[in-house]
């Protein structure tokens, strides 16, 4: 489902390119904002977000934020411009095609965040560093 408020297509008047000079089209991302989650103590999780959005701007990337405190676990999925901080953190992994979670220091909670630049890449969030690999056998495990 493509929510109308973020459904965009290629803006031919303002070409955005990546660091390699390749044209960047608006990204498809999971976009459910903040939802309660059952993702805990797993190497990878699916977002369980049913909304796939076309990001408003070509420079935006997919972002996922996993938070756990004494009361609940939440997963946030959005589009965001990597030139701007998100939750006060720089999106340093925005060029990655996969969403590899990195822990960030936040008082009173466990806070992980990832960003990525392939379509719907924030649907599959990866916590275990061993999954950040080009090994096809491991990819099969991730995407079962």
């Amino acid at each position: 489902t493509i929510p109308p408020h973020v459904q965009k297509s290629v803006n031919n008047d303002m070409i955005v390119t990546d660091n390699n000079g390749a044209v960047k089209f608006p990204q498809l991302c999971k976009f459910c904002d903040v939802r309660f989650s059952t993702c805990d103590n797993q190497k990878s999780c699916m977002s369980n977000c049913s909304i796939t959005s076309i990001c408003e701007k070509p420079q935006e990337v997919c972002v996922a934020v996993w938070r756990k405190n004494d009361e609940n676990i939440t997963l946030e999925t959005v589009c965001h411009d990597p030139k701007l901080p998100y939750h006060d953190f720089i999106l340093e992994d925005a060029a990655s095609p996969k969403c590899i979670m990195k822990e960030k220091k936040k008082p009173g909670e466990t806070f992980f965040m990832c960003s990525c630049s392939s379509d719907e890449c924030n649907d599959n969030i990866i916590f275990s560093e061993e999954y950040n690999t080009s090994n096809p056998d491991l990819l099969l495990v991730i995407f079962q």
């Epitope: 489902t1 493509i2 459904q7 089209f25 498809l28 076309i54 630049s117 890449c121 599959n124």
Partner: antibody
Framework: QVQLVESGGGLVEPGGSLRLSCAAS????????MSWVRQAPGKGLEWVGR??????????DFAAPVKGRFTISRDDSKNTLYLQMNSLKTEDTAVYYC???????WGQGTLVTVSS | DIQMTQSPSSLSASVGDRVTITCRAS??????LNWYQQKPGKAPKLLIY???SLQSGVPSRFSGSGSGTDFTLTISSLQPEDFATYYC?????????FGQGTKVEIK
């Protein structure tokens, strides 16, 4: 410069097979979902199917009329999208467009004619 | 699958005329509706997305409205380059389906 260039169209007999290719350039092909849309001569537009990124498993979806006969694949190392068409029927005759899924970018199309 | 029905299937109009094309979905698609223009031998071009948002570079004489099941594309003052075939498309669910098209011809 962004380009989507289809090739592989031509004349084929009913029941035959054909493989279309779409060579992409100017953008990071591996990052995007891709689709095929077709248009029979003098008729309207019909979505054929899509393939998601290899990073997310490369899942495919198809329109009912082609399900089980057509397959979509991608070779990210060659920046190429493929449409394998088997058990072709006369009603599959159309111009086939390669498109950046859900975004307004299309190739020029390649004509497939199924006729005896 | 969601069926999209356009009307009329063709129309004749003169330069300067106001032209209205309608599109009806077989079930509610909220505002998940796109309008394309296609000229002979060319790939389609997106005019309107999300029912009423004008695609970048498209002249302001094109406008879209509607939500739910009923949608309208309006050309406020038809220009010579607007003679073409127009398609609606829903992007609410897979497969994304098109209307059968409306051909706008010169009267």
């Amino acid at each position: 410069q962004v380009q989507l260039v289809e090739s592989g169209g031509g004349l084929v007999e009913p029941g035959g097979s054909l493989r279309l290719s779409c060579a992409a350039s100017g953008f990071t092909f591996s990052n995007y979902w891709m689709s095929w849309v077709r248009q029979a001569p003098g008729k309207g537009l019909e979505w054929v199917g899509r393939i998601k990124t290899t990073y997310s498993g490369g899942a495919t979806d198809f329109a009912a009329p082609v399900k089980g006969r057509f397959t979509i694949s991608r070779d990210d190392s060659k920046n190429t999208l493929y449409l394998q068409m088997n058990s072709l029927k006369t009603e599959d005759t159309a111009v086939y467009y390669c498109t950046l899924d859900l975004r307004d970018y299309w190739g020029q199309g390649t004509l497939v004619t199924v006729s005896s | 699958d969601i069926q999209m029905t356009q009307s009329p299937s063709s129309l004749s109009a003169s330069v300067g005329d106001r032209v209205t094309i309608t599109c009806r979905a077989s079930q509610s698609i909220s505002s998940y509706l796109n309008w394309y223009q296609q000229k002979p031998g060319k790939a389609p071009k997106l005019l309107i997305y999300a029912a009423s948002s004008l695609q970048s570079g498209v002249p302001s004489r094109f406008s879209g409205s509607g939500s739910g099941t009923d949608f309208t594309l309006t050309i406020s003052s038809l220009q010579p380059e607007d003679f073409a075939t127009y398609y609606c498309q829903q992007s609410y669910s897979t497969p994304p389906t098109f209307g059968q098209g409306t051909k706008v011809e010169i009267k």
